[in-house]
């Protein structure tokens, strides 16, 4: 024998109190699949959470975080504080990047500046808390008497005329 509840579509529940007829989910509840014996309570996006998608009879509400915070966890279960560029989030809040490190985003950790000398290059622009160093030509290229080499012209993509 087929279970009569299997005929109840999403957005309804199989009401045992009413001879297993399909009843619509009450307000602020939903069922995302058919054949459900109860409807689930809609998630409420309150406080630091804000509503990204309203609850409907067939799908739960979806939350994201208010400005100054970003989502963490499955389905944005947590809102973690943003920091400023040049900072990283620690257990006790936002802290400035230590000298020699940088962070150019509002989240994540401070990363060490690039070591230009490992690639045989010199520092063209110093690093800051917000920006990595910019590496320039190798020191040998800058020494007096070094032959100047004109770099080859970049190849044009087909169909692009020169500016």
């Amino acid at each position: 024998l087929q279970d009569p509840c299997s005929n109840c579509p999403a957005g309804t529940f199989c009401d045992n109190n009413r001879n297993q007829i399909c009843s619509p989910c009450p307000p602020n509840s939903f069922s995302s699949a058919g054949g459900q014996r109860t409807c689930d309570i809609c998630r409420q996006c309150k406080g630091v959470f804000r509503t990204r998608k309203e609850c409907s009879s067939t799908s739960n509400a979806e939350c994201d975080c208010t400005p100054g915070f970003h989502c963490l966890g499955a389905g944005c279960s947590m809102c973690e504080q943003d920091c400023k560029q040049g900072q990283e989030l620690t257990k006790k809040g936002c802290k400035d990047c230590c000298f020699g490190t940088f962070n150019d985003q509002k989240r994540g950790i401070c990363r060490p500046w690039t070591n230009c000398s490992l690639d045989g290059k010199s520092v063209l622009v110093n690093g800051t808390k917000e920006r990595d160093v910019v590496c320039g030509p190798s020191p040998a290229d800058l020494s007096p008497g070094a032959s100047s080499v004109t770099p080859p012209a970049p190849a044009r993509e087909p169909g692009h005329s020169p500016q």
Partner: nanobody, 124 residues
């Protein structure tokens, strides 16, 4: 699959106590530091407490120091948070978290797995 499952939350009156548990599976529990975080309704995620892999090193946020105690039982793969003298401002969803290494401190964190959370409501 690495999993963390919290339990022990509930409604408690101000001044009361609760003990949260976090059952861990899918990794060598004793090799990793563990932490508790909380998500209050009105503001961002807050770090609560951390414990090293062996259980020797423990750290607490100033707001819970002297009231909360973190512990772990590596033979049972379980993390605990004993919460005493609870206040209304402790109301939050509490999350168990696995850190990426054995050691920990009260500064940097490197959480790579979160539990699903357990709700603690402190109200008269």
């Amino acid at each position: 699959e690495v999993q963390l499952l919290e339990s022990g939350g509930g409604l408690v009156q101000p001044g009361g106590s609760l003990r949260l548990s976090c059952a861990a599976s899918g990794f060598t529990f004793s090799s990793y530091a563990m932490s508790w975080f909380r998500q209050p309704p009105e503001t961002g995620l807050q770090w609560v407490s951390s414990i090293g892999g062996s259980g020797g090193d423990t750290y607490y946020a100033d707001s819970v120091k002297g009231r909360f105690t973190i512990s772990r039982d590596n033979s049972k793969n379980t993390l605990y948070l004993q919460m005493n003298s609870l206040r209304a401002e402790d109301t939050a969803v509490y999350y168990c978290a696995k850190e990426g290494s054995n050691g920990t401190d009260d500064n940097y964190y490197d959480v790579d797995v979160w539990g699903q959370g357990t709700t603690v409501t402190v109200s008269s």
